[in-house]
Interface confidence: medium
Amino acid sequence: APVPPGEDSKDVAAPHRQPLTSSERIDKQIRYILDGISALRKETCNKSNMCESSKEALAENNLNLPKMAEKDGCFQSGFNEETCLVKIITGLLEFEVYLEYLQNRFESSEEQARAVQMSTKVLIQFLQKKAKNLDAITTPDPTTNASLLTKLQAQNQWLQDMTTHLILRSFKEFLQSSLRALRQM
């Protein structure tokens, strides 16, 4: 499992560590989740040829994974702190159902999948403290999420493997874009 935020994942001495600021905690939290995703992607790619597959579009039709677009205010051109923060939090909340789907998809990395899910919940809490306009954040409907989860779990094996690969790839992309945007705030 990855080393928790606030500790170094490589053997580097760090005596007299200062308490982490809010921005640094968020930055470290995202890096920590990204490390976890990398480990999960390794298992996925080793287990199947999904990472090289050209048939991603077939599975993508079943998914509505959050993506960053220019209108979200997170890119450097047209950057808007408030709009962007709402997009990041909303996107993370939307990813939660997909992270739940991942929980039974790994054999050797079961703990890692759990760590990614729990760390994302913590990240959402950090970001909600940072957000001024919480009213603009729409929480996904639990009933819709439950039926989506059932639908995803009912897919055939190939589609389930492809869905796992696409969730990890999209979540990584979303977090990387979020990381850059948060550094401008």
Partner: antibody, heavy 120, light 106 residues
Framework: QVTLRESGPALVRPTQTLTLTCTFS??????????VGWIRQPPGEALEWLAH???????YYNPALKGRLAVSKDTSKNQVVLSMNTVGPGDTATYYC????????????WGQGILVTVSS | DIQMTQSPSSLSASVGDRVTITCRAS??????LAWYQQKPGKAPKLLIY???YLADGVPSRFSGSGSGTDFTFTISSLQPEDIATYYC????????FGQGTKVEIK
């Protein structure tokens, strides 16, 4: 193996637009987290970061030069193009392109550089 | 925008000496700092990323430390092939380089 190569004119006239191309191999700019950046170095001076473009077309520019720079990518050709308008003698430099990967965001592979002289 | 102040601008040391270069950011950049080596007529080469981590294939005599605003780059035992200019660069938003430190042999 990862390689990057800069190409473009060695001599540009003042007030013209400089267009440089970075052609790379060994990685794809459609891979999430991947970035190509441009850096320049006037003779005998320090490195100066100019711009970079991410896999999802997010673009970052040096604020001091932002109005004069444009960066674009052609993923199918494995190329990134930098345009700088209204050049002057102060833009004479060796121009480098470099790759950044993932969220550690350090430039791990560099081109050999191209010397561009601005002179009439 | 964040400014990077690197010092000294040049230094002269003997083979085997410990060499230290510092880089100071005008505001907190956490651990988002890289160090590069540039030899005359060559492109820069990445030595350290994320303030403390050694890039692939870089000798262990090179090291980096610090976080926040103050960072240090160290060559534990200077070798003749280490003659070069060293630059720091931050990655918090738009990333400028330090002014460089030219390292020479006495």
């Amino acid at each position: 193996q990862v390689t990057l190569r800069e190409s473009g004119p060695a001599l540009v006239r003042p007030t013209q637009t400089l267009t440089l191309t970075c052609t790379f191999s060994g990685f794809s700019l459609s891979t999430s987290g991947m970035t190509v950046g441009w850096i320049r170095q006037p003779p005998g001076e320090a490195l100066e970061w100019l711009a970079h473009i991410w896999w999802n077309d997010d673009k970052y520019y040096n604020p001091a030069l932002k109005g004069r720079l444009a960066v674009s990518k052609d993923t199918s050709k494995n190329q990134v193009v930098l345009s700088m308008n209204t050049v002057g003698p102060g833009d004479t430099a060796t121009y480098y392109c470099a790759r950044m990967e993932d969220y550690d965001e350090a430039m791990d592979y560099w081109g050999q550089g191209i010397l561009v002289t601005v002179s009439s | 925008d964040i400014q990077m102040t690197q010092s000294p601008s040049s230094l002269s040391a003997s083979v085997g000496d410990r060499v230290t270069i510092t880089c100071r950011a005008s505001e907190n950049i956490y651990s988002n700092l890289a160090w590069y080596q540039q030899k005359p007529g060559k492109a820069p080469k990445l030595l350290i990323y994320a303030a403390t981590y050694l890039a692939d294939g870089v000798p262990s005599r090179f090291s980096g430390s610090g976080s926040g605003t103050d960072f240090t780059f160290t060559i534990s035992s200077l070798q003749p092939e280490d003659i070069a200019t060293y630059y720091c660069q931050h990655f918090w938003g738009t990333p400028p380089f330090g002014q460089g430190t030219k390292v020479e042999i006495k």
